[in-house]
């Protein structure tokens, strides 16, 4: 899963430029947009991926909010500022000096302000709810089988430790995948739930970020699981701060 030596590519991120200019002539890959070196043995951070994506932007998404503290990515694509580790900077600003605070998955969690806006810390998104609706099938999937295959998917494709897949709920045709990862639970080397969710979202949309891999082909006991819509909800360790004006 490291940068492939033979043809010098990044298996986990096709939005990279790779060349054999690393130590000892090893293949080294840099993210488009930021030029930051990426570790091709694991997922690239969402911040670097969004930054790379801005070279070929697509339409923004709008999701529905299920509860008062859940955030959705209403603002769609933007060109984010990433820190040296590739994480989102707590404060993001656009070219017209409009600024806002974001959480660890880059979703806005405050009203927009000006350059005087302060974002004291990057607030961690510790709970992600992925809400899927699958296309009609001959019968409902077996819940246990579905749980096993979705856990396998997150473990195998996104390298997310199973302990972070808190639950898989199923009421045909709705599947809900709960990812939970507190700051204290995330060890060095663990894939971030926000990054796994973003790769999954792009896979579901047919926009895989993996180099040269086919799109997502998920089957449960040989029966294709085809998703017709996805909503992703984000819950932060500290609730967001929006004015009442936004809520009306």
């Amino acid at each position: 899963h490291t940068a492939a030596q033979d043809n010098c590519t990044c298996p986990t991120n096709k939005m990279t430029v790779c060349s054999p200019d690393g130590p000892g002539g090893r293949c080294q890959c840099r993210a488009l947009g930021s030029g930051m070196a990426v570790d091709c043995s694991t997922l690239t951070s969402k911040c670097l991926l969004l930054k790379a994506r801005m070279s070929a932007p697509k339409n923004a998404r709008t999701l529905v909010r299920p509860s008062e503290h859940a955030l959705v990515d209403n603002d769609g694509l933007y060109d984010p500022d990433c820190d040296p580790e590739g994480r989102f900077k707590a404060r993001q600003c656009n070219q017209t000096s409009v600024c806002w605070c974001v959480n660890s998955v880059g979703v806005r969690r405050t009203d927009k302000g000006d350059l005087s806006l302060r974002c004291d810390e990057l607030v961690r998104t510790h709970h992600i709810l992925i809400d899927l609706r699958h296309r009609p099938t001959a019968g409902a999937f077996n819940h246990s089988d579905l749980d096993a295959e979705l856990r396998r998917l997150f473990r195998e494709r996104y390298r997310l430790h199973p302990k972070f897949v808190a639950a898989v709920h199923y009421e045909q045709p709705t599947i809900q995948i709960e990812l939970r990862q507190n700051t204290s639970q995330k060890a060095a080397g663990d894939v971030d739930i926000g990054d796994a969710a973003y790769y999954f979202e792009r896979d579901i949309k047919g926009e895989s970020l993996f180099q040269g891999r086919g799109g997502l082909d998920l089957r449960v006991r040989g029966e294709p699981l085809q998703v017709e819509r996805t909503l992703i909800y984000y819950l932060d360790e500290i609730p967001p701060k929006f004015s009442m004006k936004r809520l009306t």
Epitope: D147, A148, R151, V168, D217, R219, R221, G222
Partner: antibody, heavy 117, light 111 residues
Framework: QVQLQESGPGLVKPSQTLSLTCTVS?????????WNWIRQPPGKGLEWIGY???????LYNPSLKSRVTISRDTSKNQFSLKLSSVTAADTAVYYC??????????WGQGTLVTVSS | DIQMTQSPSSLSASVGDRVTITCRAS??????????LHWYQQKPGKAPKLLIY???NLESGVPSRFSGSGSGTDFTLTISSLQPEDFATYYC?????????FGQGTKLEIK
Amino acid sequence: QVQLQESGPGLVKPSQTLSLTCTVSGYSISSGYYWNWIRQPPGKGLEWIGYISYSGRNLYNPSLKSRVTISRDTSKNQFSLKLSSVTAADTAVYYCARDTTAYFDYWGQGTLVTVSS
Amino acid sequence: DIQMTQSPSSLSASVGDRVTITCRASESVSSSVNRFLHWYQQKPGKAPKLLIYRASNLESGVPSRFSGSGSGTDFTLTISSLQPEDFATYYCQQSNEDPYTFGQGTKLEIK
């Protein structure tokens, strides 16, 4: 009825590559499930080597990953194991098996591979 | 890797006995709806045969005298009344994490 059958040389020289093939009947390997290799040294327990999925994705045991390749030939409904740089410690009965939803419901009868000069 | 420890390593019993084999995982192998622990029987010179999947589900064609229970890290395989054909080696296997791992086996012998 799903059936799996291993085939390949029973004797491999040290430092060479062990190559085995599993022929599947009764189910198309590209239609679903995960197609595994598992081994068992004489008188010892079972060790999972890795799998190739219905879509061609691989997953390998990290302890063997640098030496293992599992591939498939969907036209023949076969999947294969290659284990490079073998030593006497790789002497084992090698089984192919189908992983349904993370358990092995169908197994081949196994084939003994001895590594010896 | 998740370590699977079976006990006892070997066991002598008589036809008609009730036998219990335990399997302990080094960390939980359960999810909210699944227990990723499976049991196999192996006879000399033969491939393992699936008995119980996901801790308590009896594989089709397996006699009802076999049963499984447990969750989290501790699991049990029970044979309610031993039959002559049950003398074999039994393995547990976890599939919650890769690499998949097996217990070291429990050899069930005739007393």
